[in-house]
């Protein structure tokens, strides 16, 4: 009888993560007497996957009925494959012996490659908000995919970005890989409603890429513009002074009125109006009793927006002026801010 040969017909097998891998092996002879074992890898550090002789291998089942001696099919199935299972598997025939069984003949090996989907991309922006015209960095990460080939694209509101750098790690062979990309985005005042999208395409996704998004509303700060105006009111001795706070984001805003440098009133933006671009407008007013003043009054509207240093706008109120002739009525946007009379 010819000497036993161990035949592994498949040089490579490709399996999707979570599925079952079938590793084929047949022997050409019933002798010598001794067990078949499966290993991942070769050499002294090889990992035992299945031993016909003994042991518990819950993920492994034999393809054929190994309780029949005439069966020479030693193929196995490994269930619930993960990227960590990738490697070269060897079917090895041992000869019964002591103190240990003696390796008699090995198959040529079957390389198991595992296709694993990338995790959902996670996009993160800068820790602190930035203002329009500034360039901010966004990162995108996805993990656990195999094989290594992967495509990553960045978009802002559907428009593809070009200023980004991408790395896939590790550089060498690995059971699975990770991708990390950093994109640079220039902010504009209109970006409150904008989105940055990271799109990952991989062979396991069958043409349906994964996307991660970041809303620029989390990143941008649009500072307000201030305008202080004086308008007449019905009472001859009263003047209405308004502070228009326009086009700001986010909403967190505190306004302080100063009269000749002294704090008169502080209020927090509450009833704001939202613009189409996502920014906000707000208005505050003061009712000033002109007859109570001998000299001109310097009124200052001071705004602290989103914890930033205060900005202010001043208005000189001439006590000798005729209230009805000054300013223009731009109070239409007012939705009930506080009134204050000065005596």
């Amino acid at each position: 009888e010819e000497e036993l040969q161990v035949i592994q017909p498949d040089k490579s097998v490709l399996v999707a993560a979570g599925e079952t891998a079938t590793l084929r092996c047949t022997a050409t002879s019933l002798i010598p007497v001794g067990p078949i074992q499966w290993f991942r890898g070769a050499g002294p550090g090889r990992e035992l996957i299945y031993n016909q002789k003994e042991g518990h291998f819950p993920r492994v089942t034999t393809v054929s009925d190994l309780t029949k001696r005439e069966n020479m099919d030693f193929s196995i199935r490994i269930g619930n494959i993960t990227p960590a299972d990738a490697g070269t598997y060897y079917c090895v025939k041992f000869r019964k012996g002591s103190p240990d069984d003696v390796e008699f003949k090995s198959g040529a090996g079957t390389e198991l490659s595992v296709r694993a989907k990338p995790s959902a991309p996670v996009v993160s922006g800068p820790a602190a908000r930035a203002t329009p015209q500034h360039t901010v960095s966004f990162t995108c990460e996805s993990h656990g995919f195999s094989p290594r080939d992967i495509t990553l694209k960045w978009f802002k509101n559907g428009n593809e970005l070009s200023d980004f750098q991408t790395n896939v790690d590790p550089v060498g062979e690995s059971v699975s890989y990770s991708i990390h990309s950093t994109a640079k985005v220039v902010l504009t005042r209109e970006d409150v409603h904008s989105q940055v999208i990271c799109e990952v395409a991989h062979v396991t996704l069958q043409g349906d890429p994964l996307r991660g998004t970041a809303n620029l509303s989390e990143t941008i700060r649009v500072p307000p513009t201030l305008e202080v105006t004086q308008q007449p009111v019905r009472a001859e001795n009263q003047v209405n002074v308004t502070c228009q706070v326009r086009k700001f984001y986010p909403q967190r805003l505190q306004l302080t009125w100063l009269e000749n440098g002294n704090v008169s009133r502080t209020e927090t933006a509450s009833t704001v109006t939202e613009n189409k671009d996502g920014t906000y407008n707000w208005m505050s007013w003061l009712l000033v009793n002109v007859s109570a003043h001998r000299d001109d009054v310097k009124l200052t509207c001071q705004v602290e927006h989103d914890g930033q240093p205060a900005v202010s706008k001043s208005h000189d109120l001439k006590v000798s002026a005729h209230p009805k002739e000054q300013g223009s009525n731009t109070a239409a946007e007012n939705t009930g801010s506080n009134e204050r009379n000065i005596y």
Epitope: E1, S29, I31, V33, G34, E54, R69, E70, K96, S98
Partner: antibody, heavy 118, light 107 residues
Framework: EVQLVESGGGLVQPGGSLRLSCAAS????????MHWVRQATGKGLEWVSA???????YYTGSVKGRFTISRENAKNSLYLQMNSLRAADTAVYYC????????????WGQGTMVTVSS | DIQMTQSPSSLSASVGDRVTITCRAS??????LAWFQQKPGKAPKSLIY???SLHSGVPSKFSGSGSGTDFTLTISSLQPEDFATYYC?????????FGQGTKLEIK
């Protein structure tokens, strides 16, 4: 059902010959290592002979040159030709199947009695 | 040849007892050790192979352990049908050899 049935035992004079047969059913005998084991009355078990799947044969020292193990695949049968019999060969002879991969005995026949006496 | 030595040669025990029989090989036999049960006038029955693996249909009250040269057979709770003679056997190399047997009797 997997079964082994021995036959051919009996009374024989010292120096005589006997041929034991073992008919296998429920499996292909040629795919397994097959054995003969004997047991003298009131004594322990003694392995006698084996034949491998490739036709290789093995014997215990006391029967070497006197006993011959063989098989006939067409009849799915195992044989033990015993020549130059001695009183010490008196025993029940069992036909035994070796295990699937390690040759561990798994199936035993019911045994056949061989008596060597004048 | 490899010598197999069983101890004790005989053992008296009661129903429900846990008993252990030992078997020693004269040289390392890996774990190619089998245990058999034989009742008077009957053919032996295979219980255990490769020191600890139970043959099909053998109740789990039988267990085997050991490797190299020292082996044990344990019966966890003796029943009347377990009183018999038990043999160990090495089958790592020819000639295969048996222990002399341990006769388990009712006390």
């Amino acid at each position: 059902e997997v079964q082994l049935v021995e036959s051919g035992g009996g009374l024989v004079q010292p120096g005589g010959s006997l041929r034991l047969s073992c008919a296998a059913s429920g499996f292909t005998l040629s795919s397994y290592d097959m054995h003969w084991v004997r047991q003298a009355t009131g004594k322990g078990l003694e392995w006698v002979s084996a034949i491998g799947t490739a036709g290789d044969t093995y014997y215990t020292g006391s029967v070497k040159g006197r006993f011959t193990i063989s098989r006939e695949n067409a009849k799915n049968s195992l044989y033990l030709q015993m020549n130059s019999l001695r009183a010490a060969d008196t025993a029940v002879y069992y036909c035994v199947r070796g295990g699937v991969w390690d040759d561990a005995f798994d199936i035993w026949g019911q045994g056949t009695m061989v008596t060597v006496s004048s | 040849d490899i010598q197999m030595t069983q101890s004790p040669s005989s053992l008296s025990a009661s129903v429900g007892d846990r008993v252990t029989i030992t078997c020693r090989a004269s040289q390392d036999i890996n774990n190619y050790l089998a245990w058999f049960q034989q009742k008077p006038g009957k053919a032996p029955k295979s219980l255990i192979y490769t020191a600890s693996s139970l043959h099909s249909g053998v109740p789990s009250k039988f267990s085997g352990s050991g490797s190299g040269t020292d082996f044990t057979l344990t019966i966890s709770s003796l029943q009347p049908e377990d009183f018999a003679t038990y043999y160990c056997q090495q089958y790592v190399s020819y000639p295969y050899t048996f222990g002399q047997g341990t006769k388990l009797e009712i006390k």
